[in-house]
Interface confidence: medium
């Protein structure tokens, strides 16, 4: 089996003129392609992988929401030579959320890493953005975490920082097919320079106090406090999955034109950012990109 191969970390690693082909090892009978896109209220980026896969042919699309950080995942596996060029994997422009200026800053500032490398997203070196409230949601927390995409025996990961709706989440995460978005939230401007070692103690959780020894006649009762390490995914009604690539419209024009519809426009988008002008533009627009004129 021969498959297209590329790796992209918010760059142009899967741009049209960088496409490679690889011959898969014996026994490998699927080509795979995956795109994971993350949208903050200040921009978006995507990770992508193409290559030889494992498992069965099929599609898996999902939309996720982690405290107002939206994630969109598309995974496609197929069993024909070079069939893994249907999704649009390359990174969209990291534009701000279009009508962002329509929202007044809410007073909180956060470090923002949207498509930045790990080196550029260290400590206090990333750019600082002003948070704002959107879609009836309050973005007063700051987030520090990572997004990871695993496909075709390749794992790519990038840091994510920005404004979120929660100020106290600790090591929360959402997962999709081969995809994880996880991290922690904090309260206060520029508090997200490094939350890797954040513990579960926060203003919302009563501190542990040493109770006096119980009186012989009374039983000390302590309130159990549990913290979830996995953020609940929105209900299906509000988490809009990505459309299957097969439902996408074919390219315009004559058969062989197939111009790369480069930057993913995720169609649909989790509810919550609906009045942001870039919602409804994520990720893969632009129909099958597999050569569809073989033998002509």
């Amino acid at each position: 089996l021969e498959c297209y191969s590329c790796v992209q970390k918010a760059d142009d690693g899967c741009s049209p003129n960088k496409m490679k082909t690889v011959k898969c090892a014996p026994g490998v009978d699927v080509c795979t392609e995956a795109v994971g896109a993350v949208e903050t209220i200040h921009g978006q980026f995507s990770l992508a992988v193409r290559g030889c896969g494992s498992g069965l042919p099929g599609k898996n699309d999902r939309g996720l929401d982690l405290h107002g950080l939206l994630a969109f995942i598309q995974l496609q596996q197929c069993a024909q030579d070079r069939c893994n060029a249907k999704l649009n994997l390359t990174s969209r422009a990291l534009d701000p959320a279009g009508n962002e200026s329509a929202y007044p800053p809410n007073g909180v500032e956060c470090y923002s890493c949207v498509g930045l490398s790990r080196e550029a997203c260290q400590g206090t070196s990333p750019p600082v953005v002003s948070c704002y409230n959107a879609s009836d949601h309050v973005y007063k927390g700051c987030f520090d975490g990572n997004v990871t995409l695993t496909a075709a025996n390749v794992t790519v990961s990038l840091p994510v920082r920005g404004c979120v709706q929660d100020e106290f989440c600790t090591r929360d995460g959402v997962t999709g097919p081969g995809f994880t978005l996880s991290g922690s939230c904090c309260q206060g401007s520029r508090c997200n320079s490094d939350l890797r070692n954040k513990t579960y103690f926060s203003p919302r959780i009563p501190p542990l106090v040493r109770l006096p020894p119980p009186e012989p006649t009374t039983v000390a009762s302590t309130t159990s406090v549990t913290t979830s390490t996995s953020a609940p995914v929105r209900p299906t009604s509000t988490t809009k999955p990505m459309p299957a690539p097969t439902s996408q419209t074919p390219r315009q024009g004559v058969e062989h034109e197939a111009s790369r519809d480069e930057e993913p426009r995720l169609t649909g988008g989790a509810a919550g950012h609906q009045d942001r002008s870039n919602s409804g533009q994520y990720p893969a627009k632009g129909g099958p990109q597999q050569p569809h004129n073989k033998g002509c």
Partner: antibody, heavy 117, light 111 residues
Framework: EVQLLESGGGLVQPGGSLRLSCAAS????????MSWVRQAPGKGLEWVSY????????YYADSVKGRFTISRDNSKNTLYLQMNSLRAEDTAVYYC??????????WGQGTLVTVTS | QSVLTQPPSASGTPGQRVTISCSGS?????????VHWYQQLPGTAPKLLIY???QRPSGVPDRFSGSKSGTSASLAISGLRSEDEADYYC???????????FGGGTKLTVL
């Protein structure tokens, strides 16, 4: 029908500037990567620069880096190449080309740039 | 000096089969990047002839075929015709140059 129409070429002195335009039609320009490729008289093809569909990703050949600037206006379906500090070796026919299935699938007819004193 | 190496000329008689080679390196063809071929008829702009190593755009006759192996690629033209007289260029992406590179071109003469 896909069409690419270059304009803006002409005669210019060394050190001068020119701005080339490429008007696109027949396809969704805002979805397409675009490139400039040039061909010196009697010579082969040389890639000059490419730009992603949104303009967020841009690359240049070493021979023009720092002197040429590629840009696009998706609202006008137009690709541009601003050429500064022109040299005699920049004399060529400049083609704009659309990137399709990993390749330049459509080319304009070209515009001639002549740099001479 | 072009990054991809092609013979400067090739020739054949009508009906014959002609092959044009394109030699690259580990930073382009050898790195797995797909190879394309362009045909440039005299006085005209280049036209895509083969993309993705061996795929023909619609409208290109099946007399034209491409192949790739290792750090090299080749274009074969069977049943040569007088209208095939043109310059032929191979192209591929190059890691070290961060952009597409072309061969120097092969002038095909139909005798």
């Amino acid at each position: 029908e896909v069409q690419l129409l270059e304009s803006g070429g002409g005669l210019v002195q060394p050190g001068g500037s020119l701005r080339l335009s490429c008007a696109a039609s027949g396809f969704t320009f805002s979805n397409a990567w675009m490139s400039w490729v040039r061909q010196a008289p009697g010579k082969g093809l040389e890639w000059v620069s490419y730009i992603s569909s949104s303009g967020s990703t841009i690359y240049y050949a070493d021979s023009v880096k720092g002197r040429f600037t590629i840009s696009r206006d998706n609202s006008k379906n137009t690709l541009y190449l601003q050429m500064n500090s022109l040299r005699a070796e920049d004399t060529a026919v400049y083609y704009c080309a659309r990137e399709g299935l990993w390749a330049f699938d459509y080319w304009g007819q070209g515009t001639l740039v002549t740099v001479t004193s | 000096q072009s990054v991809l190496t092609q013979p400067p000329s090739a020739s054949g008689t009508p009906g014959q089969r002609v092959t044009i080679s394109c030699s690259g390196s580990s930073s382009n063809i050898g790195a797995g990047y797909v190879v394309h071929w362009y045909q440039q008829l005299p006085g005209t702009a280049p036209k895509l002839l083969i993309y993705d190593n061996n795929q023909r755009p619609s409208g290109v006759p099946d007399r034209f075929s491409g192949s790739k192996s290792g750090t090299s690629a080749s274009l074969a033209i069977s049943g040569l015709r007088s209208e095939d007289e043109a310059d032929y260029y191979c192209a591929a992406y190059d890691d070290s140059l961060n952009g597409p590179v072309f061969g120097g071109g092969t002038k095909l003469t139909v005798l």
